[in-house]
Interface confidence: medium
């Protein structure tokens, strides 16, 4: 049935899906706070621009009786049930914010006549790439993949003089939603990462991972995994590690590495951590104070989703254009808007661009130090520390093939 959009005559509504199954286990109250904070800012910005309009959010909750796993496993049906709820109420906003699970976003996109924009804090999987009316405000798997290929091929830096073409990927099935889809993308045989590598094997058992650390017959020195330092320690413990091993720990949504009092534990010395550059002042931003470091990014994405809508609404109203058109639905891409903690850039496909940071543990100071940064928007690496105090021989990253270390 045709659902009317509450999106005209000076009144603009945002439909926010509050799903029990979510990419991060964030209390819905915190997400509500994020949305309300965003609404205040949007209203102020519109008012200051001389646009006397009303902007509100409707929070759509699922009953939670059937879909109560809490993670993303039963999110497909929950998302569709919420859409049905909207349809039955004959009430849809100008924009849909949520869902965050890849399964539900993919299915909802497939099963609906999307004449309105969809903004997601999550939907990390490759199956949500290149969707015309979907905007993703947390780094999707495609961005990670492009960094890894770029870094593997790099061979002209003082600390990386070899191109790599091999890798192990550790994936045991207990990952968080973001990690699950990041590793899924690396595992997929048709993905860009797999296409560019000559050798890639997925390690699914703890023992497989542990054996590789000292296996003289290993096919690669490089192991990619996803999670925090504690996750690595549970797996690796204090086991001895061959000197040529490089572990790439993907931990994008964790800015604890940048806090002043953080010391890197000894088991992190063979590890390069890939994370996101913290916003200019994210660590002392008032909004993020009562959120954990990981969930900060999730709630922030909801807030930025509201600000993005406000940004587009302002442009269309100032140009005298209609909001309930395919043009509006397709406009949430290839732009930069003022986010809560600084400018936010979206690529041609509506996916957020960011600065990824590769950290190493300094053997001198036992602190995490920035080795290089990578701008996802231009697919370019920028070295930061030209003389890193690595654990690896000659302060250079080893070759990825055993027995051909730095010469």
């Amino acid at each position: 049935s045709q659902v009317s959009q509450n999106c005209h005559n000076g009144s603009y509504e945002i439909s926010v899906l509050m799903m029990g199954n979510s990419a991060f286990a964030e209390p819905l109250k915190n997400l509500e706070d994020a949305v309300n904070e965003g609404l205040e800012i949007v209203r102020g910005r519109l008012q200051n621009a001389g646009l006397n309009v009303t902007v509100n959010a409707t929070f759509m909750y699922s009953d939670g009786l059937i879909h109560n796993s809490g993670d993303c496993r039963s999110s497909t049906c929950e998302g569709l049930d919420l859409l049905r709820k909207i349809s039955n109420a004959q009430r849809m906003g100008c924009v849909l914010i949520g869902p965050s699970c890849t399964y539900s976003t993919f299915q909802m996109y497939l099963d609906t006549e999307l004449s309105y924009p969809m903004i997601s804090a999550g939907s990390f999987g490759l199956s949500c790439d290149y969707k015309e009316t979907l905007t993703r405000l947390m780094s999707p798997a495609r961005k990670l993949m492009y960094f890894l290929v770029n870094f593997w091929k790099t061979n002209d830096l003082p600390f990386k003089t070899y191109s790599w073409s091999t890798s192990y990927v550790y994936k045991n099935g207990t990952e968080t939603e973001d990690c699950f889809w990041y590793l899924n993308a690396l595992e997929a045989s048709v993905s860009y990462f797999s296409h560019e590598l000559g050798f890639k094997v997925v390690l699914r058992q703890d023992k497989e991972f542990q054996d590789i650390l000292m296996d003289h017959n290993r096919k690669s020195n490089v192991i990619i995994m996803c999670g925090g330092p504690e996750f690595l320690y549970k797996l690796k413990g204090d086991r001895a590690v061959a000197e040529d091993i490089v572990i790439i720990l993907v931990d994008l949504f964790n800015d604890q590495y940048f806090e002043d009092n953080v010391t890197a534990p000894d088991y992190m010395k063979n590890v390069l951590v890939l994370t996101l550059s913290p916003g200019n002042s994210l660590l002392n931003s008032s909004f993020s104070r009562n959120l954990s470091p990981t969930k900060r990014d999730f709630a922030l994405a909801y807030l930025n989703g509201i600000l993005l809508f406000g940004h587009m609404l302002k442009i269309f109203l100032e140009n005298g254009e209609n909001i309930t058109t395919p043009k509006f639905a397709h406009a949430f891409r290839n732009l930069t808007f003022e986010g809560y903690d600084g400018p936010v850039t979206l690529d041609d496909w509506g996916d957020v661009d960011s600065t990824m940071v590769l950290l190493y543990t300094s053997v001198d100071t036992k602190k995490y130090k920035v080795l290089l940064t990578y701008d996802t928007h231009v697919n370019k690496t920028y070295p930061v520390d030209m003389s890193p105090t690595f654990t690896w021989k000659n302060s250079k990253l080893p070759n990825d093939i055993t027995g051909r270390g730095p010469q």
Partner: nanobody, 121 residues
Framework: EVQLVESGGGLVKPGGSLRLSCAAS????????MGWFRQAPGKEREFVSS????????YYADSVKGRFTISRDNAKNSLYLQMNSLRAEDTAVYYC??????????????WGQGTMVTVSS
């Protein structure tokens, strides 16, 4: 342009109380969020508390939760920080800060000159 002027600092004994005020003037209609930061001698400036203009949503640093209360009076364009159960480690210069709708509220655009709070017996 917005100007911020703090007052109310001083010397107080541990366990005592103080109330800081911040008067805002200028283009105050553009202000979204106001807050307090502090800087102890030899340390970096740190977030203390903030409050939004419309809904008065508040945030506090863990170190002051339950002891400090932030409030604002929009009619008077003023911000307040009620500080109870003061400790020696609360000694610092306290700065009033404000950010506009047009800038990122995570970053404060306007700052006061600061008022000194000393907690000592």
């Amino acid at each position: 342009e917005v100007q911020l002027v703090e007052s109310g600092g001083g010397l107080v004994k541990p366990g005592g109380s103080l109330r800081l005020s911040c008067a805002a003037s200028g283009r105050t209609s553009t202000i979204h969020r106001m807050g307090w930061f502090r800087q102890a001698p030899g340390k970096e400036r740190e977030f203390v508390s903030s409050i939004s203009r419309v809904s008065s949503t508040t945030y506090y640093a863990d170190s002051v939760k339950g002891r400090f209360t932030i409030s604002r009076d929009n009619a008077k364009n003023s911000l307040y920080l009620q500080m109870n159960s003061l400790r020696a480690e609360d000694t610092a210069v306290y700065y009033c800060a404000a950010s506009e709708y047009e800038v990122s509220p995570g970053k404060s655009k306007y700052w006061g000159q600061g008022t000194m709070v000393t907690v000592s017996s």
